[in-house]
């Protein structure tokens, strides 16, 4: 099928200019805007181009059938859907002083949903003054050739199928193509005819195998805790239904009167730990999810869930032991804004004795360890079964405790 | 003491991949953000970005299409790779430890000259 | 992103005055997010103040920083002939975290 465009698994642009003109180039590669989407799978925006005010108004442009293009440096050939239909190839060539005075241009961006049963193709119009004053509407014509070796090279033209879509949300329509699960690894052909004040865009033909354009769901459970080692656990479940492994990224936000910044990491289990963790910081957490071995598009985000630590933190928060055993604590002290260096924690048992010093290790500038060699069995104290170990500042303790059990 | 020695070819060809390794002595490689910058010649600082010891990443985002930034728990060392340099890559690079909760630098490498020239 | 804007460029004093330069950003920085560094030529940067007014550890109680907001000035009360360098702000509230473009401060 060579003559369709291959529809990527993220954001393109589709360029309208009118028939029977020659151009010199285009002027965007590949329809891909700066920060677009790409197969490391950051961020998807895309960048509104500044429009000639001073362009042909569509009224002087009734029933004129505008032929679009991807923009691409490359693609010079640009075979158009009716064209294509009737067999023969249009080769699009524009002006580009037309091109800036009729600059109609629209974002599609394609996948099928995580379910693997519709199709779905976004419609956004990127010349968004102009629609607001004229009738807009979408049509998305389809055909799932039955065998494609044994076809013709571009199907007939009574075998497309036209879905109409839905524009409710003003320059941005929804076209919904059903996929039978059989034709998931089928190429799907399709275009697109939008029509707008009495003018058509039509687009290319674009080919597209459904299977290669997954977007599963959002990772569910999204859940944290801090393990007994002072790190943060991130831990998600895959959504259901998706029929390969999945990668994942997962960006966190850190957010404490010390210090921001936002981090993010791509693995294909579904947990993994961030260490360096900060006492009094928030940290909002949110996982998305893509095809591990193939092509495929970035769920959306999880919803964001965001876990807050202490002023102190102690790993682990809890032990319990046995008479005769040797246990150490851990723990990193946050005060008035300022990281207690490890050097200047003390100590206290149930705050009644200081912990003698030769008990303590630096095992950073900012982790304190404290460790009791042949523990003996706790005494009970009222209520409490447990002793308190205090990590503190000199003399000045927070109020959050470990617990040691023996 | 904390000590950070850092290696890597001086000089490439406008279009190559800049790559940079920083070795970390002493002190504990674990808990710890590390850093990238860079100094061109008679000019200020920029940050290029940051990796955590479990492998979390933070890009300066003028750059970060170009850059990755990996880590080596199990040598102590971590990486710069910068794609497509030009002419204005030339600099002083640097890498740093990231002052545990704080977005300073409290240790650097001895810098390395970098030179883009056809 | 943030610009930090440093003045003077260059400050000319003799050994034994007062220094007092000047960093301001281009929008809020919490006092907590911004740092001063020193550097000599041929020599990395050595951080000197963090949160805007706590020394680094072994950093001598000669350097002192202040201010919010927009505009932070680290004060040096009596320069020694070490103390003669290219000085940097730097801030760490906002991504990407960036520098001033340095005060030198020279000896006279």
């Known amino acids: 099928f060579n003559l369709s465009y291959p529809i990527t698994p993220w954001r393109f642009k589709l360029s309208c200019m009118p028939p029977n003109s020659t151009y010199d180039y285009f002027l965007l590669p590949a329809g891909l805007s700066k920060n677009t989407s790409n197969s490391n799978g950051h961020y998807e925006t895309a960048v509104e181009p500044k429009f000639n005010s001073s362009g042909t108004h569509f009224s002087n442009l009734s029933k004129t059938t505008f032929h679009c293009c991807f923009r691409s440096e490359q693609d010079r050939n640009c075979s158009l859907c009716a064209d294509n239909i009737e067999g023969k190839t249009f080769v699009s060539t524009v002006n580009s002083l037309v091109f800036q005075q009729i600059d109609a241009n629209w974002n599609i961006q394609c996948w099928l949903k995580g379910d693997l049963k519709l199709f779905i193709c976004y419609v956004e119009s990127l010349f968004k003054n102009l629609f607001r004053n004229y009738n807009y509407k979408v049509h998305l014509l389809y055909v799932l050739p039955e065998v494609l070796e044994d076809s013709p090279l571009v199907p007939q033209k009574g075998s497309f199928q036209m879905v109409h879509c839905n524009c409710s949300v003003h320059e941005c329509c929804e076209c919904l193509v059903p996929v039978p699960t059989a034709k998931l690894n089928d190429t799907l052909l399709m275009c697109l005819k939008i029509t707008s004040g009495g003018v058509i865009f039509q687009s290319p033909l674009m080919s597209v195998q459904p299977i290669n354009m997954v977007k599963p769901d959002p990772p569910l459970g999204l859940h944290m805790e801090i393990t007994d080692d002072g790190n943060l656990k991130i831990s998600w479940s895959s959504p259901p239904l998706v029929p390969f492994p999945l990668q994942y990224q997962v960006k966190y936000s850190e957010n404490s009167t010390t210090v921001i910044r936002e981090a993010d990491k791509i693995v294909s289990a579904t947990s993994l730990l961030v260490d360096s963790i900060l006492p009094g910081s928030s940290y909002e957490v949110q996982v998305r999810g893509k095809r591990l071995d193939g092509p495929g598009i970035w769920s959306d985000w999880s919803t964001p869930r965001v876990f807050t630590t202490q002023d102190v933190i102690y790993f682990p928060p809890k032990i319990l032991t046995s008479v005769g055993s040797n246990v150490s604590f851990h723990c990193i002290y946050k005060k008035e804004n300022k990281i207690v260096p490890s050097k200047e924690i003390v100590w206290w048992m149930n705050l009644a004795e200081k912990i003698p010093q030769s008990q303590y290790d630096v095992v950073s500038d900012h982790v304190s360890k404290v460790t009791f060699f042949n523990l003996n069995e706790t005494k009970p104290r009222g209520k409490f079964t447990y002793d308190a170990v205090y990590c503190c500042n000199e003399h000045e303790c927070h109020h959050r405790y470990a617990e040691l059990y023996v | 003491q904390v000590q950070l020695q850092q290696w890597g070819a001086g000089l490439f060809k406008p279009s190559e991949t800049l790559s940079l390794t920083c070795d970390v002595y002493?002190?504990?490689?674990?808990?710890?953000?590390w850093s990238w910058i860079r100094q061109p010649p008679g000019k200020g600082l920029e940050w290029i970005g940051e990796?955590?010891?479990?492998?979390?990443?933070n890009y300066n985002p003028s750059l970060k299409s170009r850059v990755i930034i990996s880590i080596d728990t199990s040598k102590n060392q971590f990486s710069l790779k910068m794609s497509s340099v030009t002419a204005a890559d030339t600099a002083v690079y640097y890498c740093?430890?990231?002052?545990?909760?704080?977005?300073?630098?409290?240790?650097w490498g001895q810098g390395t000259l970098v030179t883009v020239s056809s | 992103e943030i610009v930090l804007t440093q003045s003077p460029g260059t400050l000319s004093l003799s050994p034994g005055e007062r220094a007092t330069l000047s960093c301001r950003a281009s929008?809020?920085?919490?006092?907590?997010?911004l740092a001063w560094y020193q550097q000599k030529p041929g020599q990395a940067p050595r951080l000197l103040i963090y949160g805007a007014s706590s020394r680094a550890t072994g950093i001598p109680d000669r350097f002192s920083g202040s201010g919010s907001g927009t505009d932070f000035t680290l004060t040096i009360s009596r320069l020694e002939p070490e103390d003669f360098a290219v000085y940097y702000c730097?801030?760490?509230?906002?991504?990407?975290?960036?520098f001033g473009q340095g005060t030198k401060v020279e000896i006279k």
């Open positions: 740093a430890r990231v002052t545990y909760g704080y977005g300073t630098f409290d240790y």
């Open positions: 929008q809020s920085v919490s006092s907590s997010y």
């Open positions: 002493g002190g504990s490689f674990r808990g710890y953000y």
């Open positions: 730097q801030q760490y509230g906002s991504s990407p975290w960036t």
């Open positions: 990796i955590s010891y479990s492998g979390f990443t």
